[in-house]
């Protein structure tokens, strides 16, 4: 019993530095508690962007200072990452863990390449 995780290959962040994507997993069991982690891979360095554990049927709760927000619907998680700048461009990987009840299952997506373009500063206007 394998757990497959699907996510889009590419997402372009908005001019306000917001990127959203769906992380979908094929659950091999009847999990009631799921943990979702977003990992960023850039230049062979891996950093944890955010993580949330949620009960099936309930909302995801990220820490107050997290740059992520999200909603869940069945085996689908809608993730939004805010405050992105050009330097944050990279591969964002969705890791899903079925925490309860046992057995535990792990699933890792192939990653979503998020491109962030810093907006051009507005030119001073002379009136």
């Amino acid at each position: 019993k394998a757990m497959h995780v699907a996510q889009p290959a590419v997402v372009l962040a908005s001019s306000r530095g917001i990127a959203s994507f769906v992380c979908e997993y094929a659950s091999p069991g009847k999990a009631t508690e799921v943990r979702v982690t977003v990992l960023r891979q850039a230049d062979s360095q891996v950093t944890e962007v955010c993580a949330a554990t949620y009960m099936m049927g309930n909302e995801l709760t990220f820490l107050d200072d997290s740059i992520c927000t999200g909603t869940s619907s069945g085996n689908q998680v809608n993730l939004t990452i805010q405050g992105l700048r050009a330097m944050d461009t990279g591969l964002y990987i969705c890791k899903v863990e079925l925490m309860y009840p046992p057995p535990y299952y792990l699933g890792i997506g192939n990653g979503t390449q998020i491109y962030v373009i810093d907006p051009e500063p507005c030119p001073d206007s002379d009136f």
Epitope: M3, L106, I108
Partner: antibody, heavy 119, light 108 residues
Framework: QVQLVESGGGVVQPGRSLRLSCAAS????????MHWVRQAPGKGLEWVAV????????HYADSVEGRFTLSRDNSKNTLYLQMNSLRAEDTAVYYC????????????WGQGTLVTVSS | EIVLTQSPGTLSLSPGERATLSCRAS???????LAWYQQKPGQAPRLLIY???SRATGIPDRFSGSGSGTDFTLTISRLEPEDFAVYYC?????????FGPGTKVDIK
């Protein structure tokens, strides 16, 4: 740097209890799955148990379920394995190990502590 | 429970030779969630490979992993004197996390 140091091993009679400790430094326990793996003398490796992230979820091998209990003290960054109703077949070196970023492979291990169950 | 079988049980080779170790799973190991460890007498195991083919930090490039599904291989391209040890594979796609029985690489 990451370091794991186990303690609490020793000789104990069958049916008795023992508590192992694993002091972690160089990282925060709650960011990782923390595992115990054991190795009987001259034998291979056997996964024993894991305590996940916030400490609410714990999973155990069938061979220790109901007898062993995992806990954690975040203020001391220390992991504990309470072993009750010990049997001769629990005799082993017990290793504390940290789960990796990409899953439950074990990227850092302690030096191990020997538990001998004998009358 | 996923049962891992390793072969051969013992591999007798000389320094400089190539070592090929096999790990077979009783059922498919999802997304190649397989790791390899090296253990020397009196020491804790050391992570060599995770994700079937990714080398752990500080591991020399003479160690390489390959495979998917149920068949995995650890290759040591040229054995150094310090490579003679016992090697274990482990799956971590689902609990209980299981190890193979090990392959001992000793000096011929």
């Amino acid at each position: 740097q990451v370091q794991l140091v186990e303690s609490g091993g020793g000789v104990v009679q069958p049916g008795r209890s023992l508590r192992l400790s694993c002091a972690a430094s160089g990282f925060t326990l709650s960011n990782y799955g923390m595992h115990w793996v054991r190795q009987a003398p001259g034998k291979g490796l056997e996964w024993v148990a894991v305590i996940w992230y916030d400490g609410r979820n714990k999973h155990y091998a069938d061979s220790v379920e109901g007898r062993f209990t995992l806990s954690r003290d975040n203020s001391k960054n220390t992991l504990y394995l309470q072993m009750n109703s010990l049997r001769a077949e629990d005799t082993a070196v017990y290793y504390c190990a940290r789960g990796g970023v990409w899953g439950s492979y074990f990227d850092y291990w302690g030096q191990g502590t020997l538990v001998t169950v004998s009358s | 429970e996923i049962v891992l079988t390793q072969s051969p049980g013992t591999l007798s080779l000389s320094p400089g030779e190539r070592a090929t170790l096999s790990c077979r799973a009783s059922q498919s190991v999802s997304s190649s969630y397989l790791a390899w460890y090296q253990q020397k007498p009196g020491q804790a195991p050391r992570l060599l490979i995770y994700g079937a083919s990714s080398r752990a930090t500080g591991i020399p490039d003479r160690f390489s992993g390959s495979g998917s599904g149920t068949d995995f291989t650890l290759t040591i391209s040229r054995l150094e004197p310090e490579d003679f040890a016992v090697y274990y594979c482990q799956q971590y796609g689902s609990s209980p996390f299981t190890f193979g029985p090990g392959t001992k690489v000793d000096i011929k």
